[in-house]
Every structure is written in C-alpha cells, then in structure tokens.
C-alpha cells in the first residue's frame, strides 16, 4: 500500500557543503513507528544514504556515522545532509514507510536535486 | 465553519494566463494538503494537482505538468493556481479541495471562461 | 493512469426506491483510497462516502458504499427528494488521482 510523498524540487547545499529539505507524507493510517530513507539517484544507479525509524513525537535516529540528521514534526520529517562535495549533487530522495500499526504503507517523492558547489579555496595571502 | 472561497476567475484571452486563490478559514490551513479540482461546463470532475501542507511538494496530473503551478501561503492561509497558455478547453469552474485522499471540503468554485 | 468506470450513467427512480451505482477500476485500487461524491448543479462536490464504506460526518445511514480491488458500489437505500443528483467516485492513490465519469440520477 502506497501513499502521497512530498518533497522540494531543488536544494542548495550551503558552502559547508550542508543540504536541508522537508520530506512531508500524507498518512493514510494513524502510524506510531515510522522509517525514513534517503535515496540517493545518479547515472541511473540508487544507493542508501541513510535511515531512520522513529517512534512519532520522538527524535529521529540515525547511525552514529550517518551523513543524516533529522527532526520530525507531525507528518513532516525536516532532513539535514552533512558533508556533502560537487560529486554529491544527485537527486536524493526521501522513501517514507509506516511500519507499524498495520499495514504496511510505503510511499516515495519525485527527489529533491541538490547541488552542491566545492568553495573556492582561499588565495595564499603574504 | 471550515470555508474555502476561490476568487480569480472570470474571462480571458487564449494564450493568456490567470491566477485563482483559495482563500481558507475556520481550520489550521497548514496542517492540510489542498488539492485543485475543475469542471467543464456540462462534464465531470478533472484532478489538476496538489500542494502538500508547507508547500515544499507539489504534484500535477500529466497533462497541466509544465503549463500549472500549484503554491500557497500558509502566513495567509492563502492557496494559488497559477495557469498559463489558456485554450478554450480550459473553461471551467476551478475548486480547491482540502485532504490528501479524500476532500473532506470544497470551496464554492470559480467559473473561468477562455475565449476572444 | 486509473480510469473509473460508473455504471449507469444516468438512471431514472422514485422516491423511496433502492439505488445502487456501480464503480469499476482498471486496475485494483486500495479501499483506503476510493471515495464518493455528491453534486447537485451549480453546486460544489460533497463527500458522502471515504475509505470505500465508512460515511462522511453528517452523511445519512441511508447512504452506504462497498467493494474492494477494482469494483465499488454506492447504494442509497431508499431514496430522498434531495438525493436526486450527480455522484461521483474518486481514487487518491496512486496519481494522478481520477473521478468516474458521473452517475445522473433524476426523478421517474
């Protein structure tokens, strides 16, 4: 079972090479535990780039390694990517998965394209 | 009282472009996705697309895809339509809908008419 | 694309009649994501039925829906003076989201 996923159609990274976007889903059912996944897409190939289960009105997880952080408001899910470099620009794509109670829904957005520009270095100064 | 009240429409020119609002009362208009809805004279019911409830989504059905665009403001509780390049088959009454599946609200409509 | 077929398209009927609409998808649809419409002219499209079979609040009990995977009917137990009108099914997922083509249903 599917479900509505909403998402920004172009992010800037800033010049610490950090994205943030809203991931919005509508709920189909009253969820209590739900999973977040960024996808990341480029030349036709998709990779995880992190993940997230939470329990509604708590704190998103993600790995102590993760790229990711996040908060989650009602419905919403705002999504900060950290670390990122001009090889990084793709079109990342939120995957929203209400887990439990049952059913199971699962919905994906179009993607967000995030680019981001590597900062000029700083010219040596006398 | 949840209200939703379109405004905007009226007659233009082919090739032309309008902008509808919806204008949304008596409910916290940023919790809710809003759909746009038309009707043909005469014909059923069209789905044109919707907005999420920041505004950071929207969605369109293939044919208005590139020609529409769906935004909002939620500090105005406000909801636009913005609808280019205007032919005669895009006379109709427009209506804003609220829910994300089902629309549990419409406003009253808004009659465009398309002609020279 | 999802197309919804209603059958009849138009149906003629007397007050206190049973009615029943039927609502045909071309591929299965979730009953979390079917839904019906009632309009009358000049007016605006008013939700009677969500999740294939739960009314709307305010909908009369006279009003009922059921079905699953790629049919649906509306049915109106015994028919009203202001039941007489235009009814619409609609699915929300996946989009685009798409209406029946309308059922007319006028006095005998």
């Known amino acids: 079972k599917a479900m509505h996923v909403a998402q920004p159609a172009v992010v800037l990274a800033n010049s610490r090479g950090t994205a943030s976007f809203v991931c919005e889903y509508a709920s189909p059912g009253k969820a209590t535990e739900v999973r977040v996944t960024v996808l990341r897409q480029a030349d036709s190939q998709v990779t995880e780039v992190c993940a997230a289960t939470y329990m509604m009105g708590n704190e998103l997880t993600f790995l102590d390694d993760s790229i990711c952080t996040g908060t989650s408001s009602g419905n919403q899910v705002n999504l900060t990517i950290q670390g990122l470099r001009a090889m990084d620009t793709g079109l990342y794509i939120c995957k929203v998965e209400l887990m439990y109670p049952p059913p199971y829904y699962m919905g994906i957005g179009n993607g967000t394209q995030i680019y981001v520009i590597d900062p000029e270095p700083c010219p040596d100064s006398d | 009282e949840v209200q939703l009240v379109e405004s905007g429409g009226g007659l233009v020119q082919p090739g032309g472009s309008l902008r509808l609002s919806c204008a949304a009362s008596g409910f916290t208009f940023s919790d809710y996705w809003i759909h746009w809805v038309r009707q043909a004279p005469g014909k059923g019911l069209e789905w044109i697309g919707w907005i999420s409830p920041s505004g950071g989504g929207t969605k369109y059905a293939q044919k208005f895809q590139g020609r529409v665009t769906i935004s909002r403001d939620n500090s105005k509780n406000t909801l636009y339509l913005q609808l280019n390049s205007l032919r005669a088959e895009d006379t109709a009454v427009y209506y804003c809908?609220?829910?994300?599946?089902?629309?549990?609200?419409w406003g009253q409509g808004t009659l465009v008419t398309v002609s020279s | 694309d999802i197309q919804l077929t209603q059958s009849p398209s138009s149906l003629s009927a007397s007050v206190g009649d049973r009615v029943t609409i039927t609502c045909r998808a071309s591929?299965?649809?979730?009953?979390?994501?079917l839904a019906w419409y009632q309009q009358k002219p000049g007016k605006a499209p008013k939700l009677l039925i969500y999740?294939?079979?739960n009314r709307a609040t305010g909908i009369p009990s006279r009003f009922s829906g059921s079905g699953s995977g790629t049919d649906f009917t509306l049915t109106i137990s015994s028919l009203q003076p202001e039941d007489f009108a235009t009814y619409y099914c609609?699915?929300?997922?996946?989009?685009?989201?798409?209406f029946g083509q309308g059922t007319k249903v006028e006095i005998k």
């Open positions: 999740d294939a079979s």
């Open positions: 591929q299965s649809v979730s009953s979390r994501f």
């Open positions: 809908a609220r829910g994300a599946y089902e629309f549990d609200y």
């Open positions: 609609q699915q929300s997922y996946p989009t685009p989201l798409t």
